[in-house]
Amino acid sequence: PEPPTACREKQYLINSQCCSLCQPGQKLVSDCTEFTETECLPCGESEFLDTWNRETHCHQHKYCDPNLGLRVQQKGTSETDTICTCEEGWHCTSEACESCVLHRSCSPGFGVKQIATGVSDTICEPCPVGFFSNVSSAFEKCHPWTSCETKDLVVQQAGTNKTDVVCGPQDRLRA
C-alpha cells in the first residue's frame, strides 16, 4: 500500500510533522513538533478567525461607521465577523456593505415592486393599464383605477399611468 503523502483533514504539514490546525476562534502560537502539540490561543476582544487555520494573527472585526450610514446588524464573535447594515431609508452599495446610499423613489407612473431593504434598493415597475401612481415614493405600489361603474358613475376622463380616472354622474338624457 502507498504511504500517505498528505496530512489528515484538519492538519497541516510542517517539518515532516502533521500538526493540528487551530479551530475557528483561535490563532496559532506555535507549531507542533514531534514532542509537543500545536499551541493555539483564543482571539481577543473585537477579533475573529472563521476557519480552521494556522494564522498567527486574528482578523479585526469590521467597523460599522455611522458616518457612512452604517449600523451593526449582528455583533461579531471570536468565530464570525461583525455584519453591518444601513440605517432606515438607506441600503448597502455592495455585498460587503461598506457604505450606504438613500433608497430610490419610484417616479409618478411607476410603482414599488419590491420595497428596499438594508442590502437592496427599491425595485420599481411601470404601472400597467388599469393602474396609476401620481406620487414619487419608495413605498407606494401602483393603485388600480377607480371603478366608476361600481359607484353608479361613468368615466368622464380616462385614467393614465399617472392619473386616476375621473368619474361623473350618468347622462340623464340617455335614460
Epitope: 500517505p4 503523502t5 489528515r8 504539514l13 510533522q17 493540528s20 500545536t38
Partner: antibody
C-alpha cells in the same frame, strides 16, 4: 498534557450491546483521528477501526463491519465505540488511541487506560 | 493470524542487550518506514516506544532503538533493566484507510 480517559468496566450478557467512551483532553480533539484496539485476555492487540472526530467518518476492519459503530461528540471531546450482538469471545479490554502522522507514516501516540468488557451468561 | 511475525518470547539478564524481530512482507515492513513498537506491562495500556522504524518519542530511554533490514524490523534494548520486562508489539501502518496490523507480541523476561 494529552489524556484519554475511558469509561469503566462493563459486564454484559450474550446478545446485548455495550458502549464505551473515551474523553480526550490536552489537544484539539477534531484535529486527530481516534482508533480503537482491543485485547482479549492473554492475547495480542487487535485493531478495530478509526473515526475522524471532525467529520464523523469511520473505517472498520472487515471482522467488525456491521457489529461495531464508532461515533463522537465533538462538543465534549469524546469518542465512543458501540459493539452489539455481543458474544463471549468479545470479552476483552477495549482501548482508544490517538493517531499521530508524519509525512510517510502514522502511529498511535497516546492510549486510554482501557475498558474491560466481560460477556458472560 | 498476524501479518507480522514476532518471536513469542525472549529473555536476557540485567545489563545485557536483546533484540526482538518483526518480520513482514515487501509491501509493508520492506517497502516503507512504517513500523512502530509498543511496550505493554501487565494490566496497563500499551505505550509507544519507537515509530517510523527508529524514532523515539519524548521520554523514552535511549536504551531503546529500532532498525530495519529487508522485510524485518527489529527493536533492540541495551543495558536491560528489570522494568523492561513486558510484552512488546510491533505494528505496521498498512495505508491511510486500513491503517494498523499488529504483530503477535513478544514477552520479554529479564532474568
Amino acid at each position: 498534557q494529552v489524556q484519554l480517559v475511558q469509561s469503566g468496566t462493563e459486564v454484559k450478557k450474550p446478545g446485548a450491546s455495550v458502549k464505551v467512551s473515551c474523553k480526550a483532553s490536552g489537544y484539539t480533539f477534531p484535529g486527530y483521528y481516534m482508533h480503537w484496539v482491543r485485547q482479549a485476555p492473554g492475547q495480542g492487540l487487535e485493531w478495530m477501526g478509526w473515526i475522524n472526530p471532525d467529520s464523523g467518518g469511520t473505517k472498520y476492519t472487515q471482522k467488525f463491519q456491521g457489529r461495531v459503530t464508532l461515533t463522537r461528540d465533538a462538543s465534549v471531546s469524546t469518542a465512543y465505540i458501540d459493539l452489539n450482538r455481543l458474544r463471549s469471545d468479545d470479552t476483552a479490554v477495549y482501548y482508544c488511541a490517538r493517531e499521530r502522522c508524519r509525512t510517510t507514516n502514522c502511529y498511535l501516540d497516546y492510549w486510554g487506560q482501557g475498558s474491560l468488557v466481560t460477556v458472560s451468561s | 493470524q498476524s501479518a507480522l511475525t514476532q518471536p513469542a518470547s525472549v529473555s536476557g539478564s540485567p545489563g545485557q542487550s536483546i533484540t526482538i524481530s518483526c518480520t513482514g512482507t515487501s509491501s509493508d515492513v520492506g517497502n516503507y518506514n512504517l513500523v512502530s513498537w509498543y511496550q505493554q506491562h501487565p494490566g496497563k495500556a500499551p505505550k509507544l516506544m519507537i515509530y517510523e522504524v527508529n524514532r523515539r518519542p519524548s521520554g523514552v530511554s535511549n536504551r531503546f532503538s529500532g532498525s530495519k533490514s529487508g522485510n524485518t524490523a527489529s527493536l533492540t534494548i541495551s543495558g536491560l533493566q528489570a522494568e523492561d520486562e513486558a510484552e512488546y508489539y510491533c505494528c505496521s501502518y498498512a495505508g491511510r484507510d486500513t491503517f494498523v496490523v499488529f504483530g503477535g507480541g513478544t514477552k520479554l523476561t529479564v532474568l
